[in-house]
């Protein structure tokens, strides 16, 4: 025998209290598929979250983050504070990248400068907190008298790989 609830479309639920009649989802709830016995509560975008898409009877609300924050996790489950380029987020907030690392975005973590010597190249432009090093031709390719830029040795930081 066919389940009468299977006839209930999205945006409704199969109301057991009313002889399995298809009733519309109450305000602030939705059902995104047919045949549902209950409607789901709409997500509310509060605090650092802001509404990107309003809830409807057939689809949940979608949130993004207020300015100064960015989304993290599936469906923007968290809002994380933006930092400036050259910084990364820690427990205490935004901190400058350690020597030998950089971040060219407002989010994410500081990453080490590229190790140019891995490809047999030299450092053409030094790295900064905001930018990676630029690798140039291999030292052997440099014309006589030319020299590559060597970054200063870090002071008391853990050993960064040689450039």
């Amino acid at each position: 025998l066919q389940d009468p609830c299977s006839n209930c479309p999205a945006g409704t639920f199969c109301d057991n209290n009313r002889n399995q009649i298809c009733s519309p989802c109450p305000p602030n709830s939705f059902s995104s598929a047919g045949g549902q016995r209950t409607c789901d509560i709409c997500r509310q975008c509060k605090g650092v979250f802001r509404t990107r898409k309003e809830c409807s009877s057939t689809s949940n609300a979608e949130c993004d983050c207020t300015p100064g924050f960015h989304c993290l996790g599936a469906g923007c489950s968290m809002c994380e504070q933006d930092c400036k380029q050259g910084q990364e987020l820690t427990k205490k907030g935004c901190k400058d990248c350690c020597f030998g690392t950089f971040n060219d975005q407002k989010r994410g973590i500081c990453r080490p400068w590229t190790n140019c010597s891995l490809d047999g190249k030299s450092v053409l432009v030094n790295g900064t907190k905001e930018r990676d090093v630029v690798c140039g031709p291999s030292p052997a390719d440099l014309s006589p008298g030319a020299s590559s830029v060597t970054p200063p040795a870090p002071a008391r930081e853990p050993g960064h790989s040689p450039q």
């Epitope: 205490k92 973590i109 080490p112």
Partner: antibody, heavy 121, light 112 residues
């Protein structure tokens, strides 16, 4: 499913080198730090260093500078740790671990199963 | 050098509550997150608490983490102790964001 699978146990002679591999799967290998940590028998966890596979950039703990070398092969999503001039005190289980990109002081969310390196004459 | 100091061992009976401390010798315990790992014999560490007080999915709510700035230390508390909680526990924080620091580890024995 994120996984870090390490190479098998090794027995080495003092003065020789060992190379341990850590094959990553289930995530974008180039977008997360891989840390190397070791644990001597009956001892605690000790940081060796870390690599950013995206560009091969590395950091080494002071104790391991000049002896440890980290590399990463992005084509196979495998990180390597080579330790040279081995001595008996290097006998330990060596772990690779992944750090999320949420913050600069985050935890290690996935660990390899560990590789036992025994240094004995 | 930054160090995290843990008691070498703690023991308690099943059903009781135990707290493992992790004291920072210099700097401010509030500067960087503290994380806690459980390690059973022959196994890799697994995360029990991350970012001071958060529990990963699958970790029972009997495990909780806290920070006490007055004593410059972090704590892992396990309530309703079970025999399966017997393991080594390690705290983990940072000296700088590229230099992780681990506590020496605490062996938890569940009596009985």
């Amino acid at each position: 499913e994120v996984q870090l699978v390490q190479s098998g146990a090794e027995v080495k002679k003092p003065g020789s080198s060992v190379k341990v591999s850590c094959k990553a799967s289930g995530y974008t290998f180039t977008s997360y730090y891989i840390y190397w940590v070791r644990q001597a028998p009956g001892q605690g966890l000790e940081w060796i260093g870390n690599i950013w596979p995206g560009n091969g950039g590395t950091f080494y703990g002071e104790k391991f500078m000049g002896r440890a070398t980290f590399t990463a092969d992005t084509s196979t999503s495998t990180a390597y740790m080579e330790l040279s001039s081995l001595r008996s005190e290097d006998t330990a289980v060596y772990y690779c671990a992944r750090r999320p990109d949420y913050s600069g002081d985050d935890y290690f969310d996935y660990w390899g199963q560990g590789t036992l390196v025994t240094v004995s004459s | 050098n930054v160090m995290l100091t843990q008691p070498h061992s703690v023991s308690e009976s099943p059903g009781k509550t135990v707290t493992i401390s992790c004291k920072l010798n210099s700097g401010n315990i509030g500067s960087y997150y503290v994380h806690w790992y459980q390690q059973r014999p022959g196994s890799s560490p697994t995360t029990m608490i991350y970012r001071d007080d958060k529990r990963p999915d699958g970790v029972p709510d009997r495990f909780s983490g806290s920070i006490d700035s007055s004593s410059n230390s972090a704590s892992l508390t396990i309530s309703g102790l079970k025999t399966e909680d017997e393991a080594d526990y390690y705290c983990h924080s940072y000296d700088s964001t590229i230099t992780p620091v681990f506590g020496g580890g605490t062996k938890l024995t569940v009596l009985g």
